[in-house]
């Protein structure tokens, strides 16, 4: 506990002090006081440097004195033989004696008292920056007008902190500018702009004069700019030494001006403004930016449009453009969005054709469709080559996005018909010679396949049975063989409107317009034994001349049998209509003059007894196409005849092409009746 005064006596005082002793006293007076220590008696064995016995006075780490020998007062009015004055409130006294004393020494008597110190004058380091005021037991500092005492209660400075600047433009100067700035001050200014704006500071060299650096290059007075984790400065000297334009890349800036006690100059003045935060002009592949600018800043919006063939995809959907905003952090929004090649996906399959597996389905890729040759060909042109277009569709130069259509090749038998022996007078044939040949089992008759969905036959074949059962692809019509062939199911029968329906068909004498179409429920798959015959063209090239040869085929009556089991065929020439008129009708059901002959009929036969007969009705009279010798077209349909083995009459198909086409077009989709 600190005391104001006290007494210190050597051991056994005033008797002789013992040998080999060491004793210490710790003196402490209250804070703010010094210590006056004085000796009134001193009798200690004398030795050089007081090496044997001594009393030692220590202040902190400093030895204030070391005493030995005898002393007496120089002043008759004062008993003090030795004294010490220390400006500190703590002191240590240590007494030591060695192992032998030649004489008897009495030691010492000392006293201490707390004394006031003048902190303002007693120390080398002045405790106050400006005014120092001493009082007993302490001191206090005070400041001149307009200065304030800092929290350390020693330093004075001007009150130049706490200003926050939020305007987008402004000016800041050191206190009193351009008069000398205050000493011993720390001025802090804060600029806080809206996010998205960066603080830009501009200074002029001549607007800056701050105490220069010391010999080591350290600024004594300094100006520092702090923006987040970036610092600019410290700056000092005559004329601003830093960049005259400081882009802080931050919306928050702290300005710190620190001065010391000496060397005040005029200070500094600066301007600042908020620049919208720039965003980098990024190189986004496969896209264009609109608007295109040299520099983009906070709040700028660009539309990024993908180049043709590229898109932005999210999940299963995509877009060809998007918007991106320059944000307050100097980065673009939607920077994750990238224009990537359009994917057209796996191409659709087509009926009766195929597309090879594409290596890629991305923009620019090419695929090729082919038809199942030789039975199908590409009807709608374009060559079957499609490329993946910018809109995500597979596109053909001719057809656009429309898929190619594989339609049956018509009129080309897999094997040509060769007569081997002299229907009546005809030869055995194979279905591959006449793959269009259709067999009707009730009534026993024929027909001609003209495409996947339609069979052409004679009206008289279907007038009595509007739901005929038909077969294709078999040479033999034996029941066992038919079971293995392709059965065709009709959907609807269309009889020519010019065909007159009779109560008693057996008595018919008028076979004009003997033509009918059967729409099938399902498409027929073509192959070597099943393929259609062509229809005649409308040009004059398809007008038959007398003598033109045609082929007929069927399972009708022969010389030997009422019905043939295996397909028969014959080649016969076109004859003038009068030749048919001249033949006497076998088993007439009416007067010979009652039979009607019209330009809708072709007369053919009469050569070597080759003719069609009962059971061949509806089959095609196939003639070589004048414009393509590899193909046959249905010039006629087996209709009627005066007598088997002579001349026969065939429906002139060319006269009905318009009706056929119209009927097929109007009924191309399945009926819902």
């Amino acid at each position: 506990e600190p005391t104001m005064y006290g007494e210190i006596l050597s051991p056994n005082y005033p008797q002789a002090y013992p040998s080999e002793v060491e004793k210490s006293w710790d003196i402490e007076v209250p804070e703010g006081y010094g210590i006056h220590l004085y000796f009134t008696h001193l009798d200690i064995e004398l030795s050089e440097n007081c090496a044997y016995d001594s009393v030692q006075i220590i202040s902190g780490d400093t030895e204030e004195g070391r005493l030995c020998g005898q002393r007496s007062s120089n002043n008759p009015h004062s008993p003090i033989v030795e004294e010490f004055q220390v400006p500190y409130n703590k002191l240590q006294v240590i007494f030591k004696s060695d192992f032998s004393n030649e004489e008897r020494f009495t030691g010492f008597a000392a006293y201490y008292v707390a004394t006031d110190i003048n902190e303002c004058t007693d120390f080398v380091d002045v405790p106050c920056s400006h005014f120092c005021n001493n009082f007993i037991g302490g001191y206090f500092c005070s400041c001149p007008p307009e200065y304030f005492l800092h929290d350390d209660m020693k330093n004075c400075g001007v009150n130049c902190s706490g200003d926050v600047f939020t305007a987008l433009i402004g000016e800041i100067a050191s206190p009193n500018y351009p008069k000398p700035y205050p000493e011993n001050s720390r001025c802090e200014y804060q600029i806080r702009l809206e996010k998205g704006f960066q603080v830009v500071v501009t200074l002029r060299r001549e607007d800056f004069d701050v105490e220069a650096a010391d010999s080591a290059g350290n600024c004594l007075d300094s100006l520092v700019f702090v923006a987040g984790d970036r610092q600019f400065g410290p700056y000092c000297g005559h004329g601003f030494p830093g960049p005259l334009n400081i882009e802080t890349k931050s919306n928050a800036l702290d300005i710190i001006f620190q001065t010391d006690l000496t060397g005040q100059k005029k200070g500094w003045k600066l301007r600042y403004h908020g620049d919208p935060m720039p965003c980098p002009k990024e190189d986004t592949p496969n896209s264009v930016w609109e608007p295109a600018k040299a520099k983009y800043v906070f709040r700028d919006v660009v539309q990024i449009t993908c180049l043709d063939g590229f898109e932005v995809v999210e999940g299963r959907v995509g877009a060809t453009s998007f918007y991106s905003t320059c944000q307050s952090n100097g980065k673009w929004s939607n920077s994750k969005l990238k224009c990537q090649p359009v994917d057209c996906g796996i191409p659709e399959s087509i009926a009766n054709g195929k597309v090879e597996d594409p290596e890629s389905t991305l923009f620019g890729s090419v695929i090729r469709y082919t038809c199942e040759e030789p039975y199908y060909y590409m009807e709608n042109g374009g060559g079957g080559e499609y490329h993946c277009a910018g809109n995500g569709s597979w596109v053909n130069e001719v057809l656009g996005p429309e898929l190619p259509k594989c339609v049956p090749v018509c009129g080309v038998p897999r094997e040509p018909f060769e007569e081997k022996q002299r229907i009546i007078g005809g030869s055995d044939a194979d279905i591959k010679n006449f793959p269009w040949q259709v067999f009707f089992d009730n009534p026993w008759a024929g027909g001609a396949l003209i495409n996947e969905y339609w069979v052409l036959t004679a009206a008289h074949v279907v007038e009595g049975n509007r739901e005929p059962t038909m077969y294709v692809g078999s040479t033999s019509v034996q029941t066992s063989r038919l079971a293995k062939s392709k059965m065709l199911t009709p959907e609807h029968v269309f009889i020519h409107p010019g065909w007159k329906l009779l109560e008693v068909p057996e008595g018919r004498t008028n076979f004009d317009n003997d033509i009918a179409l059967v729409r099938l429920k399902d498409p027929v798959k073509m192959g070597p034994t099943v393929s259609p015959i062509c229809l005649p063209g409308t040009s004059s090239d398809y007008n038959l001349m007398d003598g033109d040869l045609g082929l007929i085929s069927g399972w009708g009556r022969t010389e030997k049998r009422d019905r043939a089991v295996r397909l028969k065929a014959a080649r016969l020439p076109v004859a003038p209509l009068r030749k048919c008129k001249e033949v006497k009708v076998e088993k007439p059901t009416a007067d010979a003059e009652a039979y009607v002959f019209t330009p809708n009929m072709i007369c053919a036969g009469g050569e070597k007894g080759m003719d069609s007969c009962k059971g061949d009705s509806g089959g095609a009279f196939a003639v070589q196409d004048p414009n393509d010798k590899t193909k046959f077209y249905a010039a006629g349909l087996v209709s009627w005849g005066p007598q088997c083995g002579t001349y026969g009459l065939y429906t002139r198909v060319k006269n009905y092409v318009d009706w056929i086409m119209k009927t097929m077009q109007e009924n191309s989709t399945p009926r819902e009746d």
Epitope: E314, F322, Y323, T325, N329, K331, S333, S335, K336
Partner: antibody, heavy 116, light 107 residues
Framework: QVQLVQSGAEVKKPGASVKVSCKAS????????MHWVRQAPEQGLEWMGW????????IYAQKFQGRVTITADTSTNTAYMELSSLRSEDTAVYYC?????????WGQGTLVTVSS | DIQMTQSPKSLSASVGDRVTITCRAS??????LDWYQQKPGQSPKLLIY???YRYSGVPSRFSGSGSGTDFTLTISSLQPEDFATYYC?????????FGQGTKLEIK
């Protein structure tokens, strides 16, 4: 399939903070933006902000600036939204949503009730 | 910030009706506008993006149109499951803002 599963309902006192999590599955959050949208009872939708988990860039609506913190942990494929200094008007259902072009997938929502 | 204003705030209609909801932006948002449907107790669901593109799985009776500041969501023939609240949202620039919603109720 894509799913966003949010943490359960919370009851907080005024002045407190709340942290809502949004665990993603079926996709990598680094490839998308993760947004937070809130809906006060019987009110409309209010966008709060987003994070790009790839680089932790965030953008907040001015209204929530200083109170909201959106973070993401790419190792667990989870996004978080912390709202501090809660007041009674912060009582709402908080949704996380994933976007690139649009907000295609949303979490089921987390009800945060602020009551003394 | 861009303000989004929807009208009407609510409307009553019957199954089979044709319904139109409009959304107006306080400034040009080009075509950066999406429409969402929300049913009570559920999260919002995306219907239309980029003003006019139907999101996958959304029935064809929903269509969107408009650009700039005026946008429309049309439901050609209301179905019972369409009664909900509809929100527009601009994604032109942050902050992305929603309209206040249009509640579609059964008449």
């Amino acid at each position: 399939q894509v799913q966003l599963v949010q943490s359960g309902a919370e009851v907080k006192k005024p002045g407190a903070s709340v942290k809502v999590s949004c665990k993603a599955s079926g996709f990598n959050i680094k490839e998308y933006y993760m947004h937070w949208v809130r809906q006060a009872p019987e009110q409309g939708l209010e966008w709060m902000g987003w994070i790009d988990p790839e680089n932790a860039d965030t953008i907040y609506a001015q209204k929530f600036q200083g109170r909201v913190t959106i973070t993401a942990d790419t190792s667990t494929n989870t996004a978080y939204m912390e709202l501090s200094s809660l007041r009674s008007e912060d009582t709402a259902v908080y949704y996380c949503a994933r976007s690139r072009l649009f907000f295609a997938y949303w979490g089921q929502g987390t009800l945060v009730t602020v009551s003394s | 910030d861009i303000q989004m204003t929807q009208s009407p705030k609510s409307l009553s209609a019957s199954v089979g009706d044709r319904v139109t909801i409009t959304c107006r932006a306080s400034q040009d948002v080009r075509t950066a506008l999406d429409w969402y449907q929300q049913k009570p107790g559920q999260s919002p669901k995306l219907l239309i993006y980029s003003a006019s593109y139907r999101y996958s799985g959304v029935p064809s009776r929903f269509s969107g149109s408009g650009s700039g500041t005026d946008f429309t969501l049309t439901i050609s023939s209301l179905q019972p499951e369409d009664f909900a609240t509809y929100y527009c949202q601009q994604q032109y620039t942050t902050p992305y803002t929603f309209g206040q919603g249009t509640k579609l109720e059964i008449k």
